[in-house]
Interface confidence: low
């Protein structure tokens, strides 16, 4: 049913869904703090622009009785229940900030007539791609997939002279929400990644992964997995690894690699870590002081969601345009706005663009070093370290298939 929006006459409300099931196990209080910090900034920016309006947030909590698993598996209906609650209360804001679980976002998008924008900190799965009124402020699976294909094909760098066309993917079902959807995208037979690779096998058991490390008959030297170094160690331990093996560890929302005193453990020498380039002005902010690096990204996405709304509100008000229109609902894309920690760029489909960083472990210093960066906005790789001190032979990444000569 059509719900009236609290979104006119100088008063603009943001509906924030506070769901029990969330992409990251973050106390809702921290997300509230992030939203409130964002509101303060937005009010200041609007005031500076001479716009004398009120901006508030309404936090909508689910009752937690039915949907209490805490992870995303039971989130499908929770989002719809919250929307029903909003509908019954006739209390919808100009924008919906909320569902982070792919299941709930997909279902809400499907089951509602969305005449308002929806901003998500999460919704990583391919099923949430190309949604006209959905904006995602944490890197979705599609962006990861495009990087991997780009990197696999690259063969003109001093440290990567072979195109790759094969891969193993380790996916055992215990992954965090972000990793689950990243690996799901790589596994999907109809995805861009699968389409571009000649050989891809999913390893689902620890033993399968462990066996591949020294299997002379393996079909690929490259293994993709998702998680942190500790996750890898639990799986790999101190087992011997064939010298041609390259493990790509996807760990996007973790900036521990960049801390000054971090030393890479020995088991990381065959590993390339894919992460996001970290910002640096968050560390002292009131809402992030007690957050782990991953949770900082999650809370930051909520905060940036508020700043994005403020950015769009300012533009529409300055142009004398109505906020409760399809034009506003579809406007949250193809733009750059001033985020909390620097500029944030959204692509044509409302998905955040970022700089991904591929790290390697220097055999000299035992430190993580930047091998290359990748700008998701232009789908381009920028080499950084032209003569890396790799563990691999001749300081070059091996071919993906043992025994295959230069291509």
């Amino acid at each position: 049913s059509q719900v009236s929006q609290n979104c006119h006459n100088g008063s603009y409300e943001i509906s924030v869904l506070m769901m029990g099931n969330s992409a990251f196990a973050e106390p809702l209080k921290n997300l509230e703090d992030a939203v409130n910090e964002g509101l303060e900034i937005v009010r200041g920016r609007l005031q500076n622009a001479g716009l004398n309006v009120t901006v508030n947030a309404t936090f909508m909590y689910s009752d937690g009785l039915i949907h209490n698993s805490g992870d995303c598996r039971s989130s499908t209906c929770e989002g719809l229940d919250l929307l029903r609650k909003i509908s019954n209360a006739q209390r919808m804001g100009c924008v919906l900030i909320g569902p982070s679980c792919t299941y709930s976002t997909f279902q809400m998008y499907l089951d509602t007539e969305l005449s308002y924008p929806m901003i998500s900190a999460g919704s990583f799965g391919l099923s949430c791609d190309y949604k006209e009124t959905l904006t995602r402020l944490m890197s979705p699976a599609r962006k990861l997939m495009y990087f991997l294909v780009n990197f696999w094909k690259t063969n003109d760098l001093p440290f990567k002279t072979y195109s790759w066309s094969t891969s193993y993917v380790y996916k055992n079902g215990t992954e965090t929400e972000d990793c689950f959807w990243y690996l799901n995208a790589l596994e999907a037979s109809v995805s861009y990644f699968s389409h571009e690779l000649g050989f891809k096998v999913v390893l689902r058991q620890d033993k399968e992964f462990q066996d591949i490390l020294m299997d002379h008959n393996r079909k690929s030297n490259v293994i993709i997995m998702c998680g942190g170094p500790e996750f890898l160690y639990k799986l790999k331990g101190d087992r011997a690894v064939a010298e041609d093996i390259v493990i790509i560890l996807v760990d996007l929302f973790n900036d521990q690699y960049f801390e000054d005193n971090v030393t890479a453990p020995d088991y990381m020498k065959n590993v390339l870590v894919l992460t996001l380039s970290p910002g640096n002005s968050l560390l002292n902010s009131s809402f992030s002081r007690n957050l782990s690096p991953t949770k900082r990204d999650f809370a930051l996405a909520y905060l940036n969601g508020i700043l994005l709304f403020g950015h769009m509100l300012k533009i529409f008000l300055e142009n004398g345009e109505n906020i409760t229109t399809p034009k506003f609902a579809h406007a949250f894309r193809n733009l750059t706005f001033e985020g909390y920690d620097g500029p944030v760029t959204l692509d044509d489909w409302g998905d955040v663009d970022s700089t991904m960083v591929l790290l390697y472990t220097s055999v000299d210093t035992k430190k993580y070093k930047v091998l290359l960066t990748y700008d998701t906005h232009v789908n381009k790789t920028y080499p950084v370290d032209m003569s890396p001190t790799f563990t691999w032979k001749n300081s070059k990444l091996p071919n993906d298939i043992t025994g295959r000569g230069p291509q």
Epitope: F258, S277, P278, G279, N280, S281, L335, T336, F337, E338, G339, D341, G342, P343, V344, T345, T355, V357, V370, T373, D375, H377, V378, Y382, V384
Partner: nanobody
Framework: QVQLEESGGGSVQSGGSLRLSCAAS????????MGWVRQAPGKEREGVAL???????TYADSVKGRFTISQDNAKNTLYLQMNSLKPEDTAMYYC?????????????????????????WGRGTQVTVSS
């Protein structure tokens, strides 16, 4: 509070030179991205030249080989040396800065953004190149 103040703009004949300066105050970030962004009448803002805290510089294709960005950390001043100026360089030139990221290549990516959204801006200085 961060403040950026540009100077050095003016009118010049095609082929001539100008040197823009940007005095920065209140800027305490150790990792930053700073540079020059211009806006011609009726057009979007575009990055011209950027420099990161690690010294990495990057230029828009249209000014490569003609413009040079530099900084004097002791004076907290940013410069843009503009040589071989063309009429299409006519624009308002803004000094812009942000605590963007720790690595220079991330700063460089700002040059490829439409309307780069830096956190701090100067008021701008007008450059007019006549043929």
């Amino acid at each position: 509070q961060v403040q950026l103040e540009e100077s050095g703009g003016g009118s010049v004949q095609s082929g001539g030179s100008l040197r823009l300066s940007c005095a920065a105050s209140g800027y305490t970030y150790s990792r930053y991205c700073m540079g020059w962004v211009r806006q011609a009448p009726g057009k979007e803002r575009e990055g011209v030249a950027l420099i990161a805290s690690d010294g990495t510089t990057t230029y828009a294709d249209s000014v490569k080989g003609r413009f040079t960005i530099s900084q004097d950390n002791a004076k907290n001043t940013l410069y843009l040396q503009m040589n071989s100026l063309k009429p299409e360089d006519t624009a308002m030139y803004y000094c812009a800065a942000d605590a963007v990221n720790w690595y220079g290549s991330i700063c460089a990516s700002m040059i490829r953004r439409k309307n780069p959204a830096f956190g701090y801006w100067g008021r701008g200085t007008q450059v007019t190149v006549s043929s």
